[in-house]
């Protein structure tokens, strides 16, 4: 299915930063592995791969085509 890369943004909804208070987010975090269709506005976000939306974080991530890496699958994997 290619390489999965996570967008660095977490929108703060699940306390993506260690310095943030995550006390009120434990129930949502159980859904961290769930994905939905990417919003239409991210149609061109993933350059060499397909976009999926991390439900718990409300942020796009890319599943890269074979041979590509990077948050947006924008780089050729030299080790591929």
């Amino acid at each position: 299915d290619g390489n999965s890369t996570r967008s660095p943004e977490t929108n703060g909804l699940l306390c993506g930063d260690p310095e943030e208070n995550c006390a009120a987010t434990t129930t949502q975090s159980k859904r961290k592995g769930h994905f939905s269709r990417c919003p239409k506005q991210y149609k061109h976000y993933c350059i060499k791969g397909r976009c999926r939306f991390v439900v718990a974080e409300q942020t796009p991530s890319c599943v890269c085509d074979e041979g590509y890496i990077g948050a947006r699958c924008e780089r050729v994997d030299l080790f591929y």
Partner: antibody, heavy 116, light 106 residues
């Protein structure tokens, strides 16, 4: 705690330019998408633009496309909005907000007035 | 562009009342909808995301529901600090906000 502090607003004539800045602190700026959202006096909210964490994926509202440019400097934890060819209808409080789809932290806003 | 239409544009209510605000999208947006609260002279505050998920730190009297084109924000028992303007926002296509609903004291 998360803080976003906008600056650079002021009075400008129609056709003029202005550059807004947003200084971020309290979180790892380089990991987050950031947006500009504006609010004309007594009116509702209007999303203006966003930029992804790496500064490579950008979108604009149709109303500002071709006139405004969003950018960021992750080494300075700062977001920018270069506004050119300003019009009276661009008069608003401009907020920077954390996020691209949803906005969980907002600055206090900076007022831009376009008037002759 | 997706248009977001809120109703009512304003309402009067008393402390303890149950308040419902609706938001309709001009086309289906699945559950890509957020709700914000804004008080005069202040920045907006995120209340609800993904149509029904409560943002961290927001009181449980706020709830959201709906999918597709029709969405609802409910305040189960209005508190004095809840008098404000509420906005919905879709984030399927490029982000757009509703025109706002002002909740005033009766």
């Amino acid at each position: 705690q998360v803080q976003l502090l906008e600056s650079g607003g002021g009075l400008v004539q129609p056709g003029g330019s202005l550059r807004l800045s947003c200084a971020a602190s309290g979180f790892t700026f380089s990991r987050y998408w950031i947006s500009w959202v504006r609010q004309a006096p007594g009116k509702g909210l209007e999303w203006v633009s966003y930029i992804d964490s790496g500064g490579t994926f950008i979108n604009y509202a149709d109303s500002v496309k071709g006139r405004f440019t969003i950018s960021r400097d992750n080494s300075k934890n700062t977001l920018y909005l270069q506004m050119n060819s300003l019009r009276a209808e661009d008069t608003a409080v401009y907020y920077c907000a954390r996020g691209g789809s949803l906005f969980d932290y907002w600055g206090q806003g900076t007022l831009v007035t376009v008037s002759s | 562009d997706i248009q977001m239409t809120q109703s009512p544009s304003s309402l009067s209510a008393s402390v303890g009342d149950r308040v419902t605000i609706t938001c309709r999208a001009s086309q289906g947006i699945i559950s890509y909808l957020g709700w914000y609260q804004q008080k005069p002279g202040k920045a907006p505050k995120l209340l609800i995301y993904a149509a029904s998920s409560l943002q961290s730190g927001v009181p449980s009297r706020f709830s959201g529901s709906g999918s597709g084109t029709d969405f609802t924000l409910t305040i189960s028992s209005l508190q004095p600090e809840d008098f404000a303007t509420y906005y919905c926002q879709q984030y399927d296509a490029l982000n757009t906000f509703g025109q706002g609903t002002k909740v005033e004291i009766k």
